[in-house]
């Protein structure tokens, strides 16, 4: 399932960096969230549970990230113009079944005021 | 699995239109291929087989398409500048198992020479 454009504010700028917000439904217990820049994996975070309900959080492509019960935020720092691109949150839902993949995204525009080190 | 940028010529221009080539491995017997523009599903094609090995080809979002034993081509016509975007081939492999999703894509640049109806 492709949700297309995120229907929420996906990019939150602060201090020359950006927080990219990837939401998922509260009901989702186990998943993999990937942040794609164009078609490349930039960051990922996988949450699974074992048979004793113990949670495991893993990252193969590590970025500074923050997990809540309905979102994963990935943080990119030292923004420059090369960061302008399409970004997608690629969510693979493992639990509850059925297995499902959703892709939501938007274009990250970089304006002078958001760059980390503006030339004076 | 995200393969990222297509490592082959994904866009083939002719007569003011474009053929978008979505490749898959020869070994794949049953699959769904979606063409995404940004994060939106533009076209899809699903190939499955019944118990008697009878092949079924289905399309929920229909575009002119062409199926070979290792690719699906989607055709877009009457190109204009609004077609410039990231396009992704989203392949879901059902058979052989395990179930797998791969995303490959690239940016479709539209130049004057490729437009269907250039202003003289």
């Amino acid at each position: 399932e492709i949700n297309g454009s995120a229907n929420y504010e996906m990019f939150i700028f602060h201090n020359g960096g950006v927080q990219i917000l990837c939401k998922y439904p509260d009901i989702v217990q186990q998943f993999k969230m990937q942040l794609l820049k164009g078609g490349q994996i930039l960051c990922d975070l996988t949450k699974t549970k074992g048979s004793g309900n113990k949670v495991s959080i893993k990252s193969l492509k590590f970025c500074h990230s923050q997990l809540s019960n309905n979102s994963v935020s990935f943080f990119l720092y030292n923004l420059d113009r090369s960061h302008a691109n399409y970004y997608f949150c690629n969510l693979s839902i493992f639990d509850p079944p059925p297995f499902k993949v959703t892709l939501t995204g938007g274009y990250l525009h970089i304006y002078e005021s958001q760059l980390c080190c503006q030339l004076k | 699995e995200i393969n990222g940028s297509a490592n082959y010529e994904m866009f083939i221009f002719h007569n003011g239109g474009v053929q978008i080539l979505c490749k898959y491995p020869d070994i794949v017997q049953q699959f769904k291929m979606q063409l995404l523009k940004g994060g939106q599903i533009l076209c899809d094609l699903t190939k499955t087989k019944g118990s008697g090995n009878k092949v079924s080809i289905k399309s929920l979002k229909f575009c002119h398409s062409q199926l070979s034993n290792n690719s699906v081509s989607f055709f877009l016509y009457n190109l204009d500048r609004s077609h410039a975007n990231y396009y992704f081939c989203n392949l879901s492999i059902f058979d052989p198992p395990p179930f797998k999703v791969t995303l490959t894509g690239g940016y479709l640049h539209i130049y004057e020479s490729q437009l269907c109806c250039q202003l003289k």
């Epitope: 009901i27 074992g50 004793g52 | -």
Partner: antibody
């Protein structure tokens, strides 16, 4: 097709050691938690322990904690159970099982461990 | 640890019978909107097989004569029209917390 094949079972003396292996194929082994479950002859199923996808977390049943160790090799697609200080009550068929996110969705055929002097 | 109990421990059945197996947990297995309760079938000399997960969801390929129900601490596995190939032992299992535990099992035998 998911396949799990246990090996390494046999006769072991009380206080002795034994290492069981489980060779996995047909799925991406490193994506799944894996478990060991045992069954004493004529009895019910008993969970032994589990290990997470990369081997950094392992949990054990109170009956085996401190004596048994679960490990995995994701390059060889193999799960292990190192059994030390075995007791007669450890006699059982040991099954390797894939934890398919919300249930044991695939099981091996089992390997019999007999603890006897 | 959560204790799982099953009743009956054994049951004599005939083809076509409606079979009911009960499972009780010593504390609620409900978390959010899910009951962390699973049913397995084990035929003689074979490994267990997954039948039902989340108390009521049939695993892929499981015939629709198998039905799971219940919530909280009380669960039921129903076989609507028993077939001879359904002979074997049935276990309930929880994965609410560690250690996950199995019920003692229910043996279905031919009458």
């Amino acid at each position: 097709e998911v396949q799990l094949v246990e090996s390494g079972g046999g006769l072991v003396k009380p206080g002795g050691s034994l290492k069981l292996s489980c060779a996995a194929s047909g799925f991406t082994f490193s994506d799944y938690w894996m478990d060991w479950v045992r069954q004493a002859p004529g009895k019910g199923l008993e969970w032994v322990g589990n290990i997470d996808e990369d081997g950094s977390i392992a949990e054990y049943s109170p009956f085996v904690k401190g004596r048994f160790t679960i490990s995995r090799d994701n390059v060889k697609n193999t799960l292990y159970l190192q059994m030390n200080s075995v007791k007669s009550e450890d006699t059982a068929t040991y099954y390797c099982s894939r934890w398919g996110r919300f249930a044991f969705d695939s099981w091996g055929q089992g390997t019999l461990v007999t603890v006897s002097s | 640890d959560i204790v799982m109990t099953q009743s009956p421990s054994s049951l004599a059945v005939s083809a076509g019978d409606r079979v009911t197996i009960n499972c009780k947990s010593s504390q609620s297995l409900l978390s959010g909107s899910f009951n962390y309760l699973t049913w397995y079938q084990q035929k003689t000399g074979q490994a267990p097989k997954l039948l039902i997960f989340y108390a009521s969801t049939r695993h892929t390929g499981v015939p629709d004569r198998f039905m799971g129900s219940g919530s909280g601490t009380d669960f039921t596995l129903t076989i609507n029209s028993f077939q001879t190939e359904d002979l074997g032992d049935y276990y309930c299992h929880h994965h609410y917390n560690a250690p996950p535990t199995f019920g003692p099992g229910t043996k279905l035998e031919l009458r």
